[in-house]
């Protein structure tokens, strides 16, 4: 009879996914250990035939229409370890017949997500589960948790309650879960965490609620184990008091309403008045705390999308292990890290999209910083060696500021310029949209950049030797949208150059690439090129993969090299069908349709073809 049920069977695993089944098949091998019935149309789960499969360890009943569980339906499945009833209709009245799920003695993971379960009903559904390790109640309709919600689950370690409508968590709701280490309460309606006391918890996700305050319980001897705390997308007005959480490694506070205080705390004892903002800073650990240095273990701190106007010195002082700091999309006007040893482990600092006008980085601060994101600020008169002092800096984005690069020592200045020479670690630099008027000779000497973007600086003049020193390292160069009429850059000398973007300028000539180079992508869109002679482009034939030429007044005759590329297909020229060229009569045709004889009329013989 097995051929009647088109389930896939491999070893002791049976997959009956999405077969339109209305009931549990009764013809499966009795020694089946894994049974996947997800995505069918089961409405009720009966002890028979389910009870035949006494060897079952994994049972997936998710995404069905189950609204009825026969009492004792799972009783015979004494080896069952993993049970998923996610995305069914367990909230319907018929699911509430006495006993709910009944006892699940060996089940270690249970998924009840997406069942419209509401408070009260859940307590009747959950039975004794002494081995339960992971429980998902996500995407239901729970509004509150009581001290009776989670009883008889002494082994529970992971509890997922995301996407409910929880507004209230009664004191002691998690008291019966002494081993709970992971708790997901994201996407609920919580407004306040006033007495956080789950000492054993390691991971807590409170993102996407309406939390205005987070306060740990005042137990001076408490050793909280929390290492991961997500509070993003809430309504926090202040930096939470985390002094009791010395093991915190990951902290996400993005998308809140946080401001940091500018003055000293009014009260040096206990909880500082929220009105001062010092509820706030992790400035002192509780007296009984072994670590004594709050946030000293923190590796990742995200404060993006808040309302921070100033970072007090004392705030950065304790963050001695921090590797990633995101302060983007705030209201910062200045940022300082001047002290020796300030943020010694920081590898990524994102200060993008603030209102930064000044940036002061000490000569020996930020010694590990590799990535500095400063795009979308108002930086102008920076200390000239701001970036040269960052010994490990590899990637720097200054797009949308007003930074002017200095020339080399024999082209010094001008006043207010910033030095980009001698930064031996720097590999990627964006100076897009900085209103740079002149790029002086020697601007990047001894800075082995692989990527340089100087686009959107209309009117930019690139002096001879401005890119000197980059010949052996540069792989990507963008000079798009600068209105360049001539390019004072000896491009064929850039032996590693792979991508060159010269779009949206007024160029009509390129230097001759006579010997083979590495160029793979050349973007010449919206320029003034009429000819791309083979004498200039010959050296590119072996490497060039893509050539973008739209928006140029190409001549139909004299472009033999280009026509050859179109016909032989060695180079992928963009929009081949629409690449328009002009005859001397101003007649416009598609370049790919031009024949040699078209260019012989009137003595226009094309010597390249």
């Amino acid at each position: 009879h097995q051929d009647k049920v088109p389930c896939k069977m491999v070893d002791k695993k049976v997959s009956c996914q999405v077969l339109g089944l209305l009931q549990v098949p009764s013809v499966l091998p009795p020694d089946t250990e894994t049974l996947d019935l997800s995505g069918n149309q089961l409405r009720s789960i009966l002890a028979s035939p389910l009870g035949f499969y006494t060897a079952l360890r994994h049972l997936d009943l998710s995404t069905n229409e189950i609204s009825f569980l026969q009492p004792g339906a799972f009783q015979a499945l004494t080896h069952l370890e993993h049970l998923s009833l996610a995305h069914n209709r367990l909230a319907m009245a018929t699911a509430l017949s006495a006993g709910g799920l009944g006892p699940l003695p060996r089940v270690t993971s249970l998924d009840l997500s997406g069942n419209s379960l509401y408070s009260g009903l859940l307590e009747r559904l959950l039975g004794e589960a002494p081995s339960l390790h992971t429980l998902s109640l996500a995407e239901n309709s729970l509004t509150r948790l009581t001290r009776h919600t989670f009883r008889d689950m002494p082994a529970l370690e992971q509890l997922d309650l995301h996407s409910n409508v929880l507004m209230d968590i009664e004191d002691g709701a998690f008291e019966g879960l002494p081993r709970l280490t992971h708790l997901n309460l994201s996407r609920n309606s919580l407004t306040c965490i006033s007495d956080f006391s789950l000492q054993q918890l390691r991971v807590l996700d409170l993102s996407c609620n309406s939390i205005e305050a987070f306060q740990t319980a005042s137990q001076p001897q408490a050793e909280f184990q929390l290492t991961w705390l997500d509070l993003r997308e809430n309504k926090l007005l202040h930096f939470p008091d985390l002094a009791a959480l010395p093991r915190l490694i990951y902290l996400n506070l993005s998308n809140n309403l946080i401001r940091l205080p500018t003055g000293p705390p009014q009260d040096s004892k206990g909880i500082h008045a929220p009105s001062e903002g010092w509820s706030a800073l992790p400035l002192s650990a509780p007296s009984g705390n072994a670590s004594g240095r709050p946030l000293s273990q923190l590796l990742n701190l995200d404060l993006s999308y808040n309302e921070i106007e100033l970072i007090p010195d004392s705030f950065l002082e304790h963050l001695t292990s921090l590797c990633f700091l995101n302060l983007s999309r705030n209201c910062l006007r200045t940022f300082e890290a001047r002290r020796l040893g300030s943020l010694p482990c920081l590898m990524l600092l994102d200060l993008s999209h603030n209102a930064l006008e000044t940036l002061e980085l000490g000569a020996r601060a930020l010694g590990s910083l590799r990535t500095l994101l400063l795009q979308g600020n108002a930086l102008r008169d920076l200390p000239p060696y701001t970036f040269a002092n960052l010994a490990s800096l590899q990637r720097l984005n200054l797009q949308g500021n007003r930074v002017s690069p200095c020339g080399g020592p024999d082209e010094p200045g001008p006043s207010g310029c910033v030095a980009f020479s001698g930064i031996t670690s720097l590999r990627s630099l964006s100076l897009v949209d900085n209103e740079i008027e002149l790029l002086r000779a020697g601007a990047f000497l001894h800075t082995p950049l692989t990527e340089l973007d100087l686009s959107s600086n209309p009117g930019l003049e690139v002096a001879t030797g401005a890119l000197g020193g980059l010949e052996a390292s540069l792989e990507v160069l963008a000079l798009q949208g600068n209105g360049l009429m001539v390019l004072q850059v000896d491009l064929p000398c850039f032996i590693c150059l792979k991508r060159l973007n010269l779009a949206e300028n007024r160029l009509s000539h390129l230097p001759a690439w006579t010997q083979a180079v590495s160029l793979e992508v050349l973007d010449l869109r919206n320029n003034s090129f009429s000819l791309l002679p083979g004498s200039a482009m010959g050296g590119l034939e072996t490497s060039l993969r893509r050539l973008y030429l739209q928006g140029n007044p190409l001549s139909c005759c004299g472009n033999g090299w280009l026509a050859a590329q179109l016909h032989q297909g060695r180079v992928d020229v963009d929009a081949t069908q629409d690449l328009i060229c002009r005859f001397s009569s101003q007649e416009e045709v598609s370049l790919s349709h031009v024949r040699p004889e078209d260019c012989e009329k009137g003595g226009l013989k094309n010597i390249n073809l």
Partner: antibody
Framework: EVQLLESGGGLVQPGGSLRLSCAAS????????MSWIRQAPGKGLEWVSG????????HYADSVKGRFTISRDNSKNTLYLQMNSLRAEDTAVYYC???????????WGQGTLVTVSS | QSVLTQPPSASGTPGQRVTISCTGS?????????VHWYQQLPGTAPKLLIY???NRPSGVPDRFSGSKSGTSASLAISGLRSEDEADYYC???????????FGGGTKLTVL
């Protein structure tokens, strides 16, 4: 620690020649522009000559152009100043100095005295 | 005659604030070239005090500050101390001379 040590100064007759050396240590010599600056007894500072990191570009003050030649040997971490057709007004303490990108002289040697006298 | 003009001398009493000026022209300071300041204690080599108009190298006390406007630059020393007694020089680049130029120097006396 950055160190610059000049040598080669001494007494020379007008019209004579002298070669000054400056031994550099404690930094990557080949990354820096280098200059010679002099100071006549009781007078102010005067920039004499400068050379780019690889020696390809040299600059001179008008007062020494055609008589002095600056050079460098990056393999020896040494800067040189060849002084020919010396005059009495060339008498001074000669300092070698390192220049950063903004052309400031951030490190100086202790100086070597050149006396041109008959 | 130096290209950059400084007063030959300046003086002040301990704790006072003194300012030393450096006047150039449209081919040096006025052209936007940066100005640097040096301190030369008696019998020693000059030492960089201020670079790029306003910036102090590490180790230089914040009593020393620089400013620039138009064709002139200034060095200010507040809270004057006896150890500040020295010669002070400004320096810039001159595009017409195509070289670096110094001021004539100012001898500061702490009374």
């Amino acid at each position: 620690e950055v160190q610059l040590l000049e040598s080669g100064g001494g007494l020379v007759q007008p019209g004579g020649s002298l070669r000054l050396s400056c031994a550099a240590s404690g930094f990557t010599f080949s990354d820096y522009y280098m200059s010679w600056i002099r100071q006549a007894p009781g007078k102010g500072l005067e920039w004499v000559s400068g050379v780019s990191w690889n020696g390809s570009r040299t600059h001179y003050a008008d007062s020494v152009k055609g008589r002095f030649t600056i050079s460098r040997d990056n393999s020896k971490n040494t800067l040189y100043l060849q002084m020919n057709s010396l005059r009495a007004e060339d008498t001074a303490v000669y300092y070698c100095a390192r220049q950063r990108q903004l052309a400031e002289f951030d490190y100086w040697g202790q100086g070597t005295l050149v006396t041109v006298s008959s | 005659q130096s290209v950059l003009t400084q007063p030959p001398s300046a003086s002040g009493t301990p704790g006072q604030r003194v300012t030393i000026s450096c006047t150039g022209s449209s081919s040096n300071i006025g052209a936007g070239y940066v100005v640097h300041w040096y301190q030369q204690l008696p019998g020693t080599a000059p030492k960089l005090l201020i670079y790029a108009d306003t910036n102090r190298p590490s180790g230089v006390p914040d009593r020393f500050s620089g400013s620039k406007s138009g064709t002139s630059a200034s060095l200010a020393i507040s809270g004057l101390r006896s150890e500040d007694e020295a010669d002070y020089y400004c320096q810039s680049y001159d595009s017409s001379l195509r070289g670096w130029v110094f001021g004539g120097g100012t001898k500061l006396t702490v009374l």
